[in-house]
């Protein structure tokens, strides 16, 4: 019933109305898909082809720029190698982190021989520095991708970088790696279908499970083939992985290799009339809900079908005990490949496979220190049993009738006169935003999702790869194959010129202030505000 | 002390069929990924097949798919090369060996090898 | 045809120096992938003379180092003794058709 859009605008319209600003890509470069938002800076970094972006916040039309090519004989070296000129041979950047509070880290596919550098940003925003270290260039096998059409999720804390991606030329040894730092390179186990199959990497978090750091886990999420077993013929599956922080490797057959990694499956779907439910397997993006309590964030999922008959975009919500809960759970089991996947019911080793080590829940120091049952055991037993099902056993959103599906999504947690509400941006295959509000019916994850907006941010149709959020400049960075867009995060005005008009479009950042529809500032004492989200009901609100 | 003991090669005809065998001891078996490696009289080494811990994965030279099978029992430490269709370009010295995964990057290298079973296909 | 080439054969005399070539391409060695060298003394198996491009197992004598570069590999061996007299050979994961290659070998022989 709220398919309908309050608003629907054109690229034409959005121009018009000076609610976008586009960056429309350099002749040289590309693939603006790497993201690295810093508030603080004002900046946004971009990696792309052969470039690397720092656009001010403000606005984008303000940019400084590096160019990072690979040499000549790099770029003949992978032509020779039958690899596509243009497409392929080039520098694509994948990884852009915070390294410090004066460099970043980047790391680019080098022509398909990856390739890693540091970017000096200057202690404070004044000094204006943005430079590539020249002196200083790593191997970037294990952190970014040889192939640019691979997926790669990555996280920088601590000087050790996490990134899920291909380690080797021909795309096919995933994996999750632990490197910098002053440690051995870790990483999942290879050769082996059970932990990793063929994933497609989404993206890291880091998320505290208590107050004690040495509990830290990094989360990765993913999709990945579904084994054998697991389901009847070939299908995908999405996946929360968790890895202790402070794992480094066990001994005998785990040396460097992670000994807490687990793995879940991420349910999305909706029940059929047939009794069949229909699945939303292709986690496409996923955005993390920080509020009040950082250990138990919200996850936010964007899913999509994986049936070329039945196209299909839903996005899920799933909290973080729950997560725990299903890690706490039983093992996947099988006694050979042509076995079903069982719980295992047999005795779990002391200390339970995938718990850090740590003084909060093990007497244990060091994975090292890991009794040889317990790595026997986290080798063959990466996957849990149970899958992880979204609050409320249903989508928030989802949209079957539609030529596009989700691509991103970014969530904003908005005050208004009746409550907090979040916000979803979500990003298409086809270069539309929409913006979609959940409304707490009964309880509040019991939810009802209304399109407030749906916007065109390219003037071309093209796929949205990444998303970022400023609340401190209340807007909106998009971005995609051609450029980089822009655009506030409301357009309270364009809803209309009377009290009713505001009001019924339920949009949390905007109210009647008397004389328009503008901002809602929760500490502005006006009495005259106007705002029903929950309900929508302009005569209760609208006395004039 | 790793050791590895190849047995079961000897002279069979083209189109014949052979079973090797590699009894492992000195540390633990089912640990390891494992392979067969042939050098052919006079020439350099060819990687044929190589088989993970748990058999979950398993790789062939194209040369030899289809006709070779590896397989492992950890019960017995036992890691085994059946040989079918044998042809005259399959003579060599057949030498098993264990992955040692030693480098930073875990490529694979082959730290320890078998003394080898040589294997002559000839009418 | 070896994947990986190497000279078929070097010499030197006692107490020199020599070093080995290994030459691949951007989807073996120029991949960023470790080379690994053996040694296989007449009538014995292969065994594992460096690993990781520049590493020794223990026993290894320190007159024996390796180093990559781009598509290409080293080995050098100083302080040349009699019992060097081997068969040498470069390794490089390939992933995965074929899994692993090895280079064509190279003959060292010592002089005198």
């Known amino acids: 019933k709220n398919n309908v859009p309050r608003l629907k605008l054109s690229y034409k319209e959005m121009l018009e109305s000076n609610n976008v600003i586009t960056f429309n890509g350099l002749a040289n470069s590309s693939s603006y898909h790497t993201f690295l938002l810093d508030e603080e800076r004002s900046r946004l970094y971009v990696g792309a082809k052969d470039h690397i972006f720092s656009f001010d916040l403000v606005n984008i039309k303000d940019f400084q720029k590096i160019v990072w090519p690979v040499s000549y004989t790099r770029r003949d070296e992978c032509k020779w190698a039958g690899k596509d000129i243009l497409k392929e041979c080039a520098n694509f950047i994948k990884v852009l982190k915070a390294y410090n509070q004066t460099h970043l880290y980047a790391c680019g596919t080098g022509a398909f021989h990856p390739i890693c550098t540091y970017i000096e940003i200057g202690h404070h925003p004044e000094d204006n520095i943005f430079k590539l270290e020249n002196s200083h260039f790593e191997n970037g096998r294990g952190k970014s991708p040889y192939d640019p059409k691979l997926l790669t999720a990555s996280l920088l804390i601590d000087g050790e970088l996490y990134s899920g991606t291909a380690a080797d030329f021909m795309g096919r040894d995933f994996a999750i790696f632990r490197t910098l730092g002053h440690h051995h390179p870790i990483r999942t186990e290879q050769h082996d279908s059970r932990w990793l199959n063929d994933p497609k990497f989404i993206s890291a978090h880091l998320i505290s499970e208590s107050d004690n750091p040495e509990d830290d886990k990094v989360y990765f999420f993913f999709r990945e083939n579904a084994i054998d077993g697991e389901h009847s013929g070939k299908a995908t599956h999405a996946r929360i992985g968790q890895i202790c922080k402070n794992d480094f490797g066990g001994h005998r057959s785990l040396v460097n290799k992670w000994t807490t990694f687990l793995k879940a499956r991420l349910i999305c779907s909706v029940p059929g009339p047939n009794g069949i439910d229909t699945h939303f397997d292709e986690l496409q993006d996923v955005f993390l809900m920080n509020f009040k309590d950082p250990k138990n964030p919200v996850v936010y999922g964007v899913f999509t079908t994986s049936s070329n008959i039945f196209k299909g975009s839903a996005v899920c919500m799933y909290s973080m005990s729950d997560v725990r809960r299903v890690f706490l759970g039983p093992y996947a089991h099988r006694d050979g490949p042509n076995y079903q996947w069982v719980p295992y019911q047999g005795r779990v080793p002391y200390p339970r496979p995938g718990t850090c080590p740590s003084k909060t829940f093990g007497g244990f120091d060091s994975t090292k220190d890991l009794p040889d049952d317990v790595i026997t055991f986290a080798r063959s037993h990466p996957a849990m049993y149970n899958p992880v099902f979204p609050m409320n056993n249903r989508p928030i959103v989802i949209k079957t009738d539609v030529n596009y599906q989700f691509t991103q999504i970014v969530v904003d947690r908005v005050d208004a006169e009746d409550g907090q509400y979040d916000v979803m941006f979500i990003g298409t295959d086809v270069g539309t935003v929409l913006k979609v509000v959940s409304i707490p019916k009964e309880t509040w994850y019991d939810l009802e999702e209304v399109l407030l907006e749906e916007m065109t941010v390219f003037r071309e149709p093209t796929a949205i790869s990444a998303m970022e959020l400023s609340t401190k400049q209340q807007q909106l960075y998009i971005g995609s194959t051609a450029g980089v867009a822009q655009l506030p995060l409301h357009r309270c005005d364009i809803y209309g010129k009377a009290c009713a008009e505001c009001c019924l479009a339920r949009d949390p950042y905007c109210a009647w202030d008397g004389s328009a529809c503008s901002r809602y500032f929760p500490t502005a004492k006006r009495a005259t505000r106007a705002q029903d989200i929950r309900n929508g009901d302009p005569l209760t609100h609208c006395s004039d | 002390e790793v050791q590895l003991l190849e047995s079961g090669g000897g002279l069979v005809q083209p189109g014949g069929s052979l079973r090797l065998s590699c009894a492992a001891s000195?540390?633990?078996?089912?640990?390891?990924?494992m392979n067969w490696v042939r050098q052919a009289p006079g020439k350099g080494l060819e990687w044929v097949s190589g088989?993970?811990?748990?058999?979950?994965?398993?790789d062939y030279a194209d040369s030899v798919k289809g006709r070779f099978t590896i397989s492992r029992d950890n019960s017995k430490n036992t890691l085994y090369l059946q040989m079918n269709s044998l042809r005259a370009e399959d003579t060599a010295v057949y030498y098993c060996?264990?992955?040692?995964?030693?480098?930073?990057?875990?490529?694979?290298?082959?730290?320890?090898w078998g003394q080898g079973t040589l294997v002559t296909v000839s009418s | 045809q070896s994947v990986l080439t190497q000279p078929p054969s070097v010499s030197g005399a006692p107490g020199q120096r020599v070093t080995i070539s290994c030459t691949g391409s951007?989807?073996?060695?120029?991949?960023?992938?470790?080379v690994h060298w053996y040694q296989q003394l007449p009538g014995t198996a292969p065994k594992l003379l460096i690993y990781?491009?520049?590493n020794r197992p223990s026993g290894v004598p320190d007159r024996f180092s390796g180093s990559k570069s781009g598509t290409s590999a080293s080995l050098a061996i100083t302080g040349l003794q009699a019992e060097d007299e081997a068969d040498y050979y470069c390794?490089?994961?390939?992933?995965?058709?074929?899994?692993?290659?090895f280079g064509g070998g190279t003959k060292l022989t010592v002089l005198g």
């Open positions: 390794q490089s994961y390939a992933g995965p058709n074929p899994y692993v290659v």
């Open positions: 990781g491009n520049s």
């Open positions: 951007s989807s073996n060695i120029g991949a960023g992938y470790d």
């Open positions: 060996a264990r992955s040692g995964y030693s480098s930073s990057w875990f490529d694979p290298d082959f730290d320890y």
């Open positions: 000195g540390f633990t078996f089912d640990s390891y990924e």
């Open positions: 088989i993970s811990w748990n058999s979950g994965w398993i």
